[in-house]
Interface confidence: medium
């Protein structure tokens, strides 16, 4: 016989609860955890349950993106009576359990953070011994990954009428502001920030018409730092080509 409950309410502290006479499931997760790219982060998750002194088999699961259906990033299983939760899945080997599920703690450590880790995570616990039950955080914890700017691509491309244009793409969180500088541009030219669809941390700025030979520099800056990269434009034989 499998008995199950899911959370039906949530207060401002992200304590997710299901209550009925003589039983109570709840999960406590913070709304958000922030950390810098390259560092590690801890996603806290603790729970309470109605099955007193349960020591049967259990599984701890973390998934990303959406509850119930999102891809699992971590899973471990503990045998009856065991406090060791044996890891069965750790995406890219970067996820490990910090908490002890036997003590109602599913807290997870994420190593070597990348901007792609910036998403919502959901903890879940399953009992499968004499008692069968499961519970999952429905609202989860948002992992907010910050990063200093990094220019990921800078290039000069041909455009109509033998002209050239320059593109600069940078990533960072907060999304960096981009600026171009170069011959006849003055000190700098601020570019309109345009995050690319589906790539929320990527920003691209275009210099539509390069009118002079020389060095063009793209600068990316946010509250965590700045980065710059340059391209060189040299036109030969009446603008029939360019060296960059």
């Amino acid at each position: 016989f499998v008995r199950t409950k899911i959370d039906t309410t949530e207060n401002l502290l992200n304590t997710e609860v299901h209550s009925s006479p003589a039983q109570r499931w709840s999960m406590q997760v913070p709304p958000e955890v922030s950390a810098e790219a390259g560092d590690a982060a801890v996603l806290p998750c603790t729970f309470t349950h109605p099955h007193r002194h349960y020591d049967g088999p259990l599984t701890a699961i973390w998934r990303a993106g959406e509850p119930y259906a999102g891809p699992q990033v971590f899973r471990c299983a503990a045998a009856r009576g065991s406090e060791l939760c044996q890891t069965a899945l750790s995406l890219h080997g970067r996820f490990r359990l910090l908490g002890n599920p036997r003590r109602n703690d599913l807290s997870l450590r994420v190593e070597r953070l990348a901007l792609a880790d910036d998403r919502r995570y959901f903890c879940r616990v399953e009992f499968a011994g004499d008692v069968h039950d499961r519970y999952e955080s429905r609202h989860g914890v948002r992992l907010h990954v910050t990063a200093a700017p990094r220019i990921v691509n800078i290039s000069v491309l041909p455009s109509p009428a033998h002209a050239f244009r320059a593109l600069c793409t940078a990533e960072g969180e907060p999304p960096p502001a981009l600026a171009w500088s170069g011959p006849a541009l003055g000190n700098s030219l601020a570019a309109v920030r345009s995050p690319r669809e589906g790539h929320g941390h990527l920003v691209t700025a275009e210099l539509p018409a390069l009118t002079h030979d020389g060095r063009y520099t793209c600068t990316a800056a946010n509250s965590l730092g700045r980065s710059e990269a340059s391209v060189y434009l040299f036109r030969f034989h009446g603008a029939s080509g360019a060296s960059t």
Epitope: V2, T4, I6, T8, Y68, A69, L89, A128, R134, E136
Partner: antibody, heavy 122, light 107 residues
């Protein structure tokens, strides 16, 4: 492509046996509980059996308990249903289905095979 | 075992109509309810899970609501491809059980 492909159905006499297979591709089936669901001709859906991701826990409908055995070979990403002592009322299309939830439970069945027909008749 | 009862057992409607199908559980199942669509000769397709979560790739005209014992599947504006049979299913306890189905036919 993520899919499930059943095989092994056919015509069998009452009291006979069949073994159904379900090959999973495009995902690691060991991460998920897997189930068999059947549908008799012109009738509704009936849950038959579920097995946990690791294969250590199995569950059966009362109508098949003691006659059917669910198993899995995670190295082959394959689910099985061994059906013994078959009866006329077991005649149905048998679907294998993946649990959306996780390794022990089925919060819903989010991926289904195309089904394989089992006919029990003399 | 938990009994799942769907109503109506069949319904006739036209393209563009709003259709509601209900499912009642014989005991409290919290939100552990899924809805499926099945067309003749095809496998069921998951539409809604945990009562109200829309499965990826399913059009937003489908929605689910309810908790406890009473649940509803709503199709806000029927499209020609929506004519099929719909099943609810509880995953609160084993044995998992399905409703008897609701056949949605063209008026």
């Amino acid at each position: 492509e993520v899919q499930l492909l059943e095989s092994g159905g056919g015509l069998v006499q009452p009291g006979g046996s069949l073994r159904l297979s379900c090959a999973a591709s495009g995902f690691t089936s060991s991460s998920y509980a897997m189930s068999w669901v059947r549908q008799a001709p012109g009738k509704g859906l009936e849950w038959v059996s579920t097995i946990s991701g690791g294969g250590g826990s199995t569950y059966y409908a009362d109508s098949v308990k003691g006659r059917f055995t669910i198993s899995r070979d995670n190295s082959k990403n394959t689910l099985y249903l061994q059906m013994n002592s078959l009866r006329a009322e077991d005649t149905a299309v048998y679907y294998c289905a993946k649990a959306i939830g996780s390794s022990w439970y089925s919060d819903a069945f989010d991926l289904w095979g195309q089904g394989t027909m089992v006919t029990v008749s003399s | 075992d938990i009994q799942m009862t769907q109503s109506p057992s069949s319904v006739s409607a036209s393209v563009g109509d709003r259709v509601t199908i209900t499912c009642r559980a014989s005991q409290d199942i919290s939100s552990w309810l899924a809805w499926y669509q099945q067309k003749p000769g095809k496998a069921p397709k998951l539409l809604i899970y945990v009562a109200s979560s829309l499965q990826s790739g399913v059009p937003s005209r489908f929605s689910g609501s309810g908790s406890g014992t009473d649940f509803t599947l709503t199709i806000s504006s029927l499209q020609p491809e929506d004519f099929a049979t719909y099943y609810c299913q509880q995953s609160y306890s084993i044995p998992y059980t399905f409703g008897q189905g609701t056949k949605l036919e063209i008026k």
